[in-house]
């Protein structure tokens, strides 16, 4: 039944970039400026997204596809389809409600976005710290202390409920 109805529906013949105009006896009319229809058989065209303010146009709107936005320098996209722009921080910082703040000791951020996260806890894998962590870089784990003495075998201890020192990643 659905298939029969769609064959009789003149609107189903209207391609993307047009809409089925009820005011003009259901003929296919092109989408007006600043609007689009991405699929056929539409009875209206959607308004194009406008990239204003902190948003900038990544892809112009066409009659068949919406505009795409990204963020101006110093900001980055958040959310599906870049629905929000969030301020960048420097490496070694994270964005808080009070602005960009340095990572607290024991955490790092190697990007201009996101949050500071704890240094890897090398001891969880029975390894030792080869290179200390910084605000911008994670620690580098090396061989376990036992591996450095010939003939010694290393056993990885189970993770304790409370782990002082470095946090794992």
């Amino acid at each position: 039944f659905e298939r029969t109805r769609s064959l009789q529906d003149p609107c189903s013949n209207c391609p993307a970039g047009t809409f089925c105009d009820n005011n003009r006896n259901q003929i296919c009319s092109p989408c007006p400026p600043n609007s689009f229809s991405s699929a056929g058989g539409q009875r209206t065209c959607d308004i194009c997204r406008q990239c204003k303010g902190v948003f900038r146009t990544r892809k112009e709107c066409s009659s068949t596809s919406n505009a795409e936005c990204d963020c101006t320098p110093g900001f980055h996209c958040l959310g599906a389809g870049c629905s929000m722009c969030e301020q960048d921080c420097k490496q070694g910082q994270e964005l808080t409600k009070k602005g960009c703040k340095d990572c607290c000791f024991g955490t790092f951020n190697d990007q201009k976005r996101g949050i500071c996260r704890p240094w890897t806890n090398c001891s969880l894998d029975g390894k030792s710290v080869l290179v200390n962590g910084t605000k911008e870089r994670d620690v580098v784990c090396g061989p376990s202390p036992a591996d450095l003495s010939p003939g010694a075998s290393s056993v990885t201890p189970p993770a304790p409920a409370r782990e002082p020192g470095h946090s794992p990643q």
């Epitope: 024991g106 949050i115 500071c116 704890p118 240094w119 409370r162 946090s167 794992p168």
Partner: nanobody
Framework: AVQLVESGGGLVQPGGSLRLSCAAS????????MGWYRQAPGKQRELVAM???????YYVDSVKGRFTISRDNAKIAIDLQTNSLKPEDTAVYYC??????????WGKGTQVTVSS
């Protein structure tokens, strides 16, 4: 000390979803950030998702767009909504609470198995 109790793990088919929960109790003063780590057999424990006190988040690349971490500051609890699960997500998931470099705490872990 801080106690962390995880729940919500289990066996799920590929493409399925689970919601992992973690509640903190005990001597809680200033929890700076909370997160979820996972450890698969024979692999290193890795950070999956973390949320700080401002609500900022971090996700490891392999779960971006599939997992969502949320935090209830009043209850001192976090959830991890895991969607479109894959066999490679199979691991023990540990809740982690970071107060400072010297003070951070672990839950006992909850098993997540993704298999058909």
């Amino acid at each position: 000390a801080v106690q962390l109790v995880e729940s919500g793990g289990g066996l799920v088919q590929p493409g399925g979803s689970l919601r992992l929960s973690c509640a903190a109790s005990g001597s809680i003063f200033s929890i700076n950030r909370m997160g979820w780590y996972r450890q698969a057999p024979g692999k290193q424990r890795e950070l999956v998702a973390m949320i700080n006190s401002s609500g900022g988040t971090y996700y490891v690349d392999s779960v971006k767009g599939r997992f969502t971490i949320s935090r209830d500051n009043a209850k001192i609890a976090i959830d991890l909504q895991t969607n479109s699960l894959k066999p490679e997500d199979t691991a023990v998931y540990y809740c982690h609470c970071w107060v400072s470099h010297e003070m951070n705490y672990w839950g006992k872990g909850t098993q997540v198995t993704v298999s058909s």
